[in-house]
Amino acid sequence: FVRTKIDTTENLLNTEVHSSPAQRWSMQVPPEVSAEAGDAAVLPCTFTHPHRHYDGPLTAIWRAGEPYAGPQVFRCAAARGSELCQTALSLHGRFRLLGNPRRNDLSLRVERLALADDRRYFCRVEFAGDVHDRYESRHGVRLHVTAAPRIVNISVLPSPAHAFRALCTAEGEPPPALAWSGPALGNSLAAVRSPREGHGHLVTAELPALTHDGRYTCTAANSLGRSEASVYLFRFHGASGAST
């Protein structure tokens, strides 16, 4: 795979021999679009090109993560003279073209947003008729997905010397602040771990030593809301039982 910005054939320069329109290849995308998880977002992308009145076959492509090499999340193709761009790929069926590529608009709608959609997206157009030419946005649009906190895991685990520790993992954007409360604890921020590499929206808080039986509650909060979950510690006959 050659990481090229544009692949061209030799005949593309003759399109301007007799006229010199001011347009050249360019793409316009905003730096960032924000939306809440569960909602839909529109990723705007418009372009200009030097091939006047191009009416041949074209393909519109969106990719995620990185330009030129990132995985495609959407692709559609329009036949010569057609304004209908037939979808060939829509990852999980959630991506839909809003714009009309014939009118230099590749804007994309993303449905049912999840935190995993928080990435940079790059639009690309390919001409494949008398003219072979293509162009891809180099800087892309960052889709910033926000979400109220959700506790994805809460558990009690054995520690050395017959002790127990509790772990609470939550997701959200902005990353939520976690606090533990429980017997003889009051409220404690309890060793919050930074978001992990590749899991930027996950935050974990550990309660290193559970000294009393009872209910331990983890609360996750950010500017969009709060969530809580509890575990119960009962020690009997030297063993432990934990339930949520």
Epitope: T4, T8, S26, P50, G65, A69
Partner: antibody, heavy 116, light 109 residues
Framework: QLQLQESGPGLVKPSETLSLTCAVS???????WSWVRQPPGKGLEWIGE???????TYKPSLKSRVTISVDNSKNQLSLKLTSVTAADTAVYYC???????????WGRGTMVTVSS | SSELTQDPAVSVALGQTVRITCRGD??????ASWYQQKPRQAPQLVIY???NRASGIPDRFSGSISGNTASLTITGAQAEDEAAYFC???????????FGGGTKVTVLG
């Protein structure tokens, strides 16, 4: 504000490898970055570029000798040019591409002389 | 050709208008950017894309493009505009960047 600072040895022997780094401060490294060089008294020559995701493109005539990489954790990029000759003597600049093919921020440049 | 060609030198009287050109087949497809470089300094972006002035650039600088030629015009040249000016764009394949050879602008008077 965003600043770029190139660093590396000012003198490299012929046939050896030229290694330079560019420290990015005052902003995220999330962008496209290029290395450009300028031989004494001459014009600018684009060497290649790297995206913060690791994607690279190089000038074809230099491609066999050049490697550009990015270290997101250190907020820096690097240039390696192998098998250097006197023709590689130049001021080497790193620059940020803020819009397609347009560089708005440049480092001050570092002079590299290839000589035995 | 993937080259961008500039005239090596041009002079202009103080307060007058000067036009610097950059020629190349790739300019039929891609916009050019323009940079000013003073002695012992790094280049500074002046104009990018169709005719966008970079931050802090006076409005006496403007850009245009027609056919295979991009132009940088300085209307009412000042003494501080004396510098080398370089254009850049993609090559005809679009796969990599090229710079013009540069034009040395001398402001007289």
């Amino acid at each position: 504000q965003l600043q770029l600072q190139e660093s590396g040895p000012g003198l490299v022997k012929p046939s050896e490898t030229l290694s330079l780094t560019c420290a990015v401060s005052g902003a995220s490294i999330s962008n496209w970055w290029s290395w450009v060089r300028q031989p004494p008294g001459k014009g600018l020559e684009w060497i290649g570029e790297v995206h913060h995701s690791g994607v690279t493109t190089y000038k074809p005539s230099l491609k066999s000798r050049v490697t550009i990489s990015v270290d997101n954790s250190k907020n820096q990029l690097s240039l390696k040019l192998t098998s250097v000759t006197a023709a590689d003597t130049a001021v080497y600049y790193c620059a940020r591409e803020f819009a397609d093919d347009a560089f708005d921020i440049w480092g001050r440049g570092t002079m590299v002389t290839v000589s035995s | 050709s993937s080259e961008l060609t500039q005239d090596p030198a041009v002079s202009v009287a103080l307060g007058q208008t000067v036009r610097i050109t950059c020629r190349g087949d790739s300019l039929r497809k891609y916009y050019a950017s323009w940079y000013q470089q003073k002695p012992r300094q790094a280049p500074q972006l002046v104009i990018y894309h169709k005719n966008n002035r970079a931050s802090g650039i006076p409005d006496r600088f403007s850009g245009s493009i027609s056919g295979n030629t991009a132009s940088l015009t300085i209307t009412g040249a000042q003494a501080e505009d004396e510098a080398a000016y370089f254009c850049n764009s993609r090559d005809t394949s679009g796969n990599y960047l090229v710079f013009g050879g540069g034009t040395k602008v001398t402001v007289l008077g």
